[in-house]
């Protein structure tokens, strides 16, 4: 059982979205009096993995050759010392892409956006899907989400984004999924190039900058939910 | 639970200065751009400043451009709108707005009232 | 600028009755209508976002329509708490405009 030890750290190898068929290293980092490590993974026989620890004992590698639908999910790791288990670690959600056909993205009205107007990034899939994620390459939040707008299945979601300013350009591609098996995504959709215009080069606006001049830069992460940017499978239901 | 608190408001005379202040808790602060709009007693809704996240994109309503400043610190999850050359027509009650990225304002303080008379 | 116009500017209504309000805009602003309700003394709160999207908590007696120029929201039965002005907003380009409000009353 959890005693007073601190829990461990949790993390995959080289990231926790994985295309079907490549391989995966979990790892579960606890402290050099661990003893041995177990990986639990939710909706799973526990423990769904044991490991002795790697020299110096502090960490153990919990390792997947090829990603398949089986492992998806939601994985914990836990660590035994001498004193006994420690708290679960924070969990890792391993999300596999490539279950589903890839869908279309596209920007409404048009991919080339002037600095202080809106967007809106529109994901297409052929069979209805019931959640739609978006990405944005080389994002400090990678990975964001949203839930189709209506509890059932469609075809398509609509990520709208206002005001746009030049943090809003870049490479973004698609995903879409069913609420069933949220770990379980479609191929990636051909990325989609947004470019944001009327920007300046200095990052610093003068403070009488009035709305018909074009913004400047901006580190605003990327919010089309309006809430903070998820890294992993955190939703945010509409 | 989101919650936005203004303060700064009062009577200050035509040609004045005041700065309000936006407390903001239950939310990450630094995540989301802000706003401030404004509503003369009696009137409709007029939106007047607009700061992104970081501070380095602003934007203003022409009725305000170069006399009113919007600034932020996320050290302090605070808003400021610091208003000079003030005049009678910017008489209102202000409102702090968290932007929702999506062209929204999804929370709303409860406004600080600035009369400019003399 | 965008200008929005929004009508009536008041209306009266019974409880249970639908109450449709419309919002007009004067160029193209695709889907970015919002709207919100206003009582007495109190700060605006956002009831619908992006034409038809209604925010967390909003009771689902609330909806929204419409693209490109001309929006509707609606009240499909009136509640005594529904007394309020509500406003529509376009947040497609800045600077952000608003209607001119729509003062709702019980007869």
């Known amino acids: 059982q959890a005693g007073p030890l601190p829990k461990p750290t949790l993390w995959a190898e080289p990231g926790s979205v994985i295309s079907w068929g490549n391989s995966v290293t979990i790892w579960c980092q606890g402290t050099l009096e661990a003893r041995e490590y177990r990986l639990d993974k939710e909706e799973s026989p526990a423990p769904w993995d044991r490991q002795n620890p790697l020299e110096p004992k502090n960490k153990a590698r919990f390792s997947i050759p090829s990603m398949t639908e089986d492992y998806a999910g939601r994985y914990r790791c836990y660590y035994r010392s001498p004193v006994g288990w420690s708290q679960p670690s924070d969990p890792l959600e391993l999300v596999m892409t490539g279950a589903y056909s890839k869908p279309t993205l596209s920007a409404l009205p048009s991919p080339l956006v002037t600095s202080g107007k809106s967007v809106t990034l529109l994901c297409q899939s052929r069979s209805p899907m019931d959640t739609f994620l978006l990405i944005k390459e080389r994002a400090a939040h990678p990975l964001l989400h949203l839930r189709s707008e209506h509890g059932a299945q469609q075809h398509q979601a609509e990520f709208p984004m206002s005001p746009v300013t030049s943090v809003h350009g870049g490479t973004y591609r698609c995903f879409s999924s069913h609420g069933f098996s949220h770990y379980l995504l479609s191929h990636p959709s051909d990325p989609l190039e947004l470019i944001v215009s009327g920007s300046l080069e200095d990052p610093r606006p003068s403070p009488t900058r009035s709305v018909s001049t074009a913004a400047g830069p901006e580190d605003q992460p990327l919010m089309p939910t309006g809430s903070v940017p998820h890294s992993g499978l955190r939703r945010h239901w509409e | 639970e989101v919650q936005l608190v203004e303060s700064g408001g009062g009577l200050v005379q035509p040609g004045g200065s005041l700065r309000l202040s936006c407390a903001a808790s239950?939310?990450?602060?630094?995540?989301?751009?802000m706003h401030w709009v404004r509503q003369a007693p009696g009137k409709g809704l007029e939106w007047v400043a607009y700061?992104?996240?970081?501070?380095?994109?602003?934007y203003y309503a022409d009725t305000v451009k170069g006399r009113f400043t919007i600034s932020r610190d996320n050290a302090k999850n605070s808003l400021y709108l610091q208003m000079n050359s003030l005049r009678a027509e910017d008489t209102a009650v202000y409102y702090c707005?968290?932007?929702?990225?999506?062209?929204?304002?999804?929370?709303w303080g409860q406004g600080t009232l600035v009369t400019v008379s003399s | 600028d965008i200008q929005m116009t929004q009508s009536p500017s008041s209306l009266s209504a019974s409880v249970g009755d639908r109450v449709t309000i419309t919002c007009r805009a004067s160029?193209?602003?695709?889907?970015?209508l919002n709207w919100y309700q206003q009582k007495p003394g109190k700060a605006p709160k956002l009831l619908i976002y992006?034409?038809?999207r209604l925010h967390s908590g909003v009771p689902s007696r609330f909806s929204g329509s419409g693209s490109g120029t001309d929006f509707t929201f609606t009240i499909s039965s009136l509640q005594p708490e529904d007394i309020a002005t509500y406003f529509c907003?376009?947040?497609?380009?800045?600077?952000?405009?608003f209607g001119g409000g729509t003062k709702l009353e019980i007869k």
């Open positions: 239950g939310f990450t602060f630094s995540d989301y751009g």
């Open positions: 992006y034409t038809s």
């Open positions: 700061i992104f996240s970081g501070s380095s994109t602003i």
């Open positions: 907003q376009q947040g497609n380009t800045l600077p952000w405009t």
């Open positions: 160029q193209d602003i695709s889907k970015f």
């Open positions: 707005a968290r932007a929702d990225g999506r062209g929204a304002m999804d929370y």
